[in-house]
């Protein structure tokens, strides 16, 4: 009777039960009942980091200079590339894509510290009775506006991100 | 695409003025950010000044605070900076930039030297 599920490494094709290629390889041809799975090395740029019944090998990522960007660790046929930043410049993201000068802080946060040669932005969230509504890599957070100071009345509540609505005292009618 | 162009360096006495330029296209400039940035021979970037969108709040380094002045006119999307009682130590090549600060949206810069 034909398989249903096969062991770790391998794979179900034709009712019967493949190897996987390993990393760093790519499959050429299934296995039959005669013989074995065929995988060929990945090409010198490119790679493969699982078991795999893959029929094209990845790309290593390129570390674009034009971008900030420099080549951290190389990759290899099992690994792809990491890139990092040029130095004084920070990732924008973990995969490292591209390259800011130094993070801003976005609405709802504060700037705690201005970025110096050495040393990024440090944000921080904007405490109750202050707001951020921009992105900036200078300003703090804000104090809400005083509604009782200008002889007006809360009508809407602060948030982190946005100031307070002040508008006029309710008259009593006599 | 964005484009930062950076004019009016040059080379000047100590104690003498010049008013930097950064002409902004390839993005709405009115709704951003804006820093001066520079590089001295030799060194690391310097944060210089900044400027929110609406041109109302401002950020002086302490080695600049009082000697130069941000400024922008948004109509002509245009950074400026006027710097006044220059020092040798204020040599540099000066870059406008926008946030985030991309690396690949930065200008030539333009060329200060302060020296006798």
């Known amino acids: 009777e034909p398989p249903t599920a096969c062991r770790e490494k391998q794979y179900l094709i034709n009712s019967q039960c493949c190897s996987l290629c390993q990393p760093g390889q790519k499959l050429v041809s299934d296995c039959t009942e005669f013989t074995e799975t065929e995988c060929l090395p990945c090409g010198e740029s490119e790679f493969l980091d699982t078991w795999n019944r893959e029929t094209h090998c990845h790309q290593h990522k390129y570390c674009d200079p034009n971008l900030g960007l420099r080549v951290q660790q190389k990759g290899t046929s099992e690994t792809d590339t990491i890139c990092t930043c040029e130095e004084g410049w920070h990732c924008t993201s973990e995969a490292c894509e591209s390259c800011v000068l130094h993070r801003s802080c976005s609405p709802g946060f504060g700037v705690k510290q201005i970025a110096t040669g050495v040393s990024d932005t440090i944000c921080e969230p904007c405490p109750v009775g202050f707001f951020s509504n921009v992105s900036s890599a200078f300003e703090k957070c804000h104090p809400w506006t005083s509604c009782e100071t200008k002889d007006l009345v809360v009508q809407q509540a602060g948030t982190n991100k946005t100031d307070v609505v002040c508008g006029p005292q309710d008259r009593l009618r006599a | 695409e964005v484009q930062l162009l950076e004019s009016g360096g040059g080379l000047v006495q100590p104690g003498g003025s010049l008013r930097l330029s950064c002409a902004a296209s390839?993005?709405?400039?009115?709704?951003?950010e804006m820093w001066w940035v520079r590089q001295a021979p030799g060194k690391g970037l310097e944060r210089v000044s900044?400027?929110?969108?609406?041109?109302?709040?401002?950020y002086y380094a302490d080695s600049v605070k009082g000697r130069f002045t941000i400024s922008r006119d948004n109509s002509k999307n245009t950074l400026y900076l006027q710097m006044n009682s220059l020092r040798a130590e204020d040599t540099a090549v000066y870059y406008c930039?926008?946030?985030?600060?991309?690396?690949?949206?930065w200008g030539q810069g333009t060329l200060v030297t302060v020296s006798s």
């Open positions: 900044a400027i929110n969108p609406q041109g109302t709040r401002t």
């Open positions: 390839g993005f709405t400039f009115r709704d951003y």
């Open positions: 930039a926008k946030l985030p600060f991309y690396f690949h949206e």
